[in-house]
Each structure stands twice: as C-alpha cells, then as structure tokens.
Interface confidence: low
C-alpha cells in the first residue's frame, strides 16, 4: 500500500505524513481503551472492534479500514455526501455579502463581517 | 520544522475561565492530535484530554470533563483549551503537545502557559 | 483509572555509571489491539517534557542510544547505560493505552 493524501486525513486512511519521524509500521488509527465507558456506538466508543470497517471498508492489516469513496474514518463511519451543504463540500468557506459561512458536517454556519464594505 | 506556539501567561480570579491558545506550524495541522497537559508547582504532570482536529473528536479526564473544553480552529491550525470555574489549585503551567497518528506519544511540546488562579 | 508508580523518586547518579528507573502500572496496559503504550519522557529543568521512549523500548528520533527501555505487562523499565550531565531532569513514565492517560510520579535524576 503507497501513501494516499486527502484534503481531510483521517484515521482511516494511511494518512499522509509530512515529515518522516515516525517509522511507518502501524496503521493510522488510535483506538483506545476505557474502562468505565461502554461502547455507546461506533463515533463514541473509545475502543472499537479492530476488524469492523463499515459502509464496505475492508479491514486491512488486522486493524486499519481503506474505505470505499466518499467514505472516511476509523471505521469508514463518516459519508462525505451527506455532510456536504448542498453544493458546498464539507469542512468548505463560502464567502457572502455580509457574512463567512463554512459547511460542517451538513451544517451551514455563517458568521456575520459587519466591517466589509456596505454591512452594518 | 515543527513547532506549538502556546499563548502567554493568565492571572485569574476564582470562578473565572480561562481559553489558553496553541498554535501550530510546520506540519499538516489535521493529521496529528492535540494533547493537553498541565503541571503544577513543583509537581508532576498530569493528562487532561485530546483532541483530533481533523474531526472535533475528543478524549478526557474525566477529572476535568464538566469544567474542560477542547476546541480547534483548523483555518489558523490552533488548538484551544477552555478551563472554567478556576479554583487556586489549577495554577498550573499548561502544555500543549503533538500526537502523531501512529503512536500515541506526544513528540512535539508547546512551551507552557502559566495560568495562576488567585484572588 | 490506571495509577503509574515510579522508583526511586530520587535518583543520584555518578557520571559514566549506568542508571535504571522502574515503572509499574496498577493493572496491565496492554491494548486491546496487542501493543503496549508506554512511554518515558524528560523533562530537563525549566523546559517543556521531550519524548525518549515509545510503545516501551523504541528510541525516539535523536534519542541517544544509551537510553533503553524494557518490560511487558505491568513492570517496566528506563536504563541509562552510562549517565552523563546533559541527562539530569525529572524522568516520567506514561500510559497511552487506556483513558484517561496517566503519568507517573517522576523520577529525579541528579549528577552526584
């Protein structure tokens, strides 16, 4: 498997990595034990079934999900298209008359610049 | 190279909050963790949570859980630990740290932010 | 949670001579994933901490050779083959694998 880079890394990809510090023998991912939290589901447990990838993903080296497009996370657990604002991809600015919007996971969140040209 | 540049020193009355800022360069902000870390007088140094910035997603001690939170900007790639209703004993220097993916060490330090919580 | 004891808490060391820091956590951190997240970090006096040692015996880049460390379980170990000035400070063991993360104590070591 070479190096993939995406817009987002995220724990379910082989990240890319920008420096080379880190020897690469183990997948990109960081499970974690806790022992007084039970598995709430899969975003919320903090330790996961290492061979379960979701939405297609197959597991890979014992503990590491290469997820089909459009899919990310850990687990494959995230859909990029439904965290797209319509045309505006995810984690996206989109500049307005008066205000900042940035689309987050699904959400159009727009903050006002009273200080351009023309807003009160 | 890589460097977390923390935000400077805070004096705080009890019951107030506190937003200690850690700014980060030279590598991919998305792709490692933020950890936090503080470390009082004297003392030794104690884990308070971490935070993924490629997602929001968090892990914390639970000893801090109600009064903590960990945010990030990924825009200015700076990473933020909000701390409320202070009490003397969190006068404290706190670190921020880089968390690679691939291990769960903290291989880059920020260089403290003495907060010190006094009436 | 996951109480990390360290030993000595003080450590005076003769330059040259070797060194050795214990570690032992309350119960075992070995993930569930098989790998064992314990780390060794220094902190030099009136520095931020710097990372020595991962997942338990691998060195750190730039981390010199003479700094080991060993163990599985619950009972770890730092050795210093030979000490030299440049490595005074407080040593701390750390768990990674189970939240929350724990450190312990600290071990200081000092030039006799």
């Known amino acids: 498997l070479g190096h993939q880079e995406f817009a987002r890394p995220s724990r379910g990809y082989l990240a890319f990595r920008d420096d080379s510090i880190w020897p690469q023998e183990e997948p990109a991912i960081r499970p974690r034990s806790s022992q007084r939290v039970p598995p709430m589901g899969i975003q919320h447990s903090k330790e996961l079934n290492r061979t379960c990838c979701l939405n297609g993903g197959t597991c890979m080296l014992g503990s590491f999900c290469a997820c089909p497009p459009s899919f990310y996370g850990r687990n494959c657990e995230h859909d990029v298209r439904k965290e797209n604002c319509g045309s505006v991809p995810h984690d996206t600015w989109l500049p307005k008359k008066c205000s900042l919007c940035k689309c987050w996971h699904g959400q159009l969140r727009c903050f006002p610049q009273a200080f351009l040209p023309g807003c009160d | 190279q890589v460097q977390l540049v923390e935000s400077g020193a805070e004096v705080k009355k009890p019951g107030a909050s506190v937003k200690v800022s850690c700014k980060a360069s030279g590598y991919t902000f998305t792709s490692y963790w933020i950890h936090w870390v503080r470390q009082a007088p004297g003392q030794g140094l104690e884990w308070i949570g971490e935070n993924d910035p490629s997602n929001g997603r968090t892990n914390y001690n639970e000893k801090f859980k109600n009064r903590v939170t960990l945010t990030v900007d990924t825009s200015i790639s700076t990473a933020y630990m909000h701390l409320s209703s202070l009490r003397s004993d969190d006068t404290a220097v706190y670190y921020c740290?880089?968390?690679?993916?691939?291990?769960?060490?903290?291989?880059?330090w920020g260089q403290g932010t003495m907060v010190t919580v006094s009436s | 949670d996951f109480v990390m004891t360290q030993s000595p808490l003080s450590l005076p060391v003769t330059p040259g001579e070797p060194a050795s820091i214990s570690c032992r956590s309350s119960?075992?951190?070995?993930?569930?994933?098989?790998?064992?997240?314990l780390e060794w970090y220094l902190q030099k006096p009136g520095q931020s901490p710097q990372l020595l040692i991962y997942k338990v015996s691998n060195r750190f880049s730039g981390v010199p050779d003479r700094f080991s460390g060993s163990g599985s379980g619950t009972d770890f170990t730092l050795k210093i083959s030979r000490v030299e000035a440049e490595d005074v400070g407080v040593y701390y063991c750390?768990?990674?694998?189970?939240?929350?993360?724990?450190f312990g104590q600290g071990t200081k070591l000092e030039i006799k």
């Open positions: 750390f768990q990674g694998s189970h939240v929350p993360l724990t």
């Open positions: 119960q075992s951190i070995v993930h569930s994933n098989g790998n064992t997240y």
């Open positions: 740290a880089r968390g690679p993916n691939y291990f769960y060490s903290m291989d880059y």
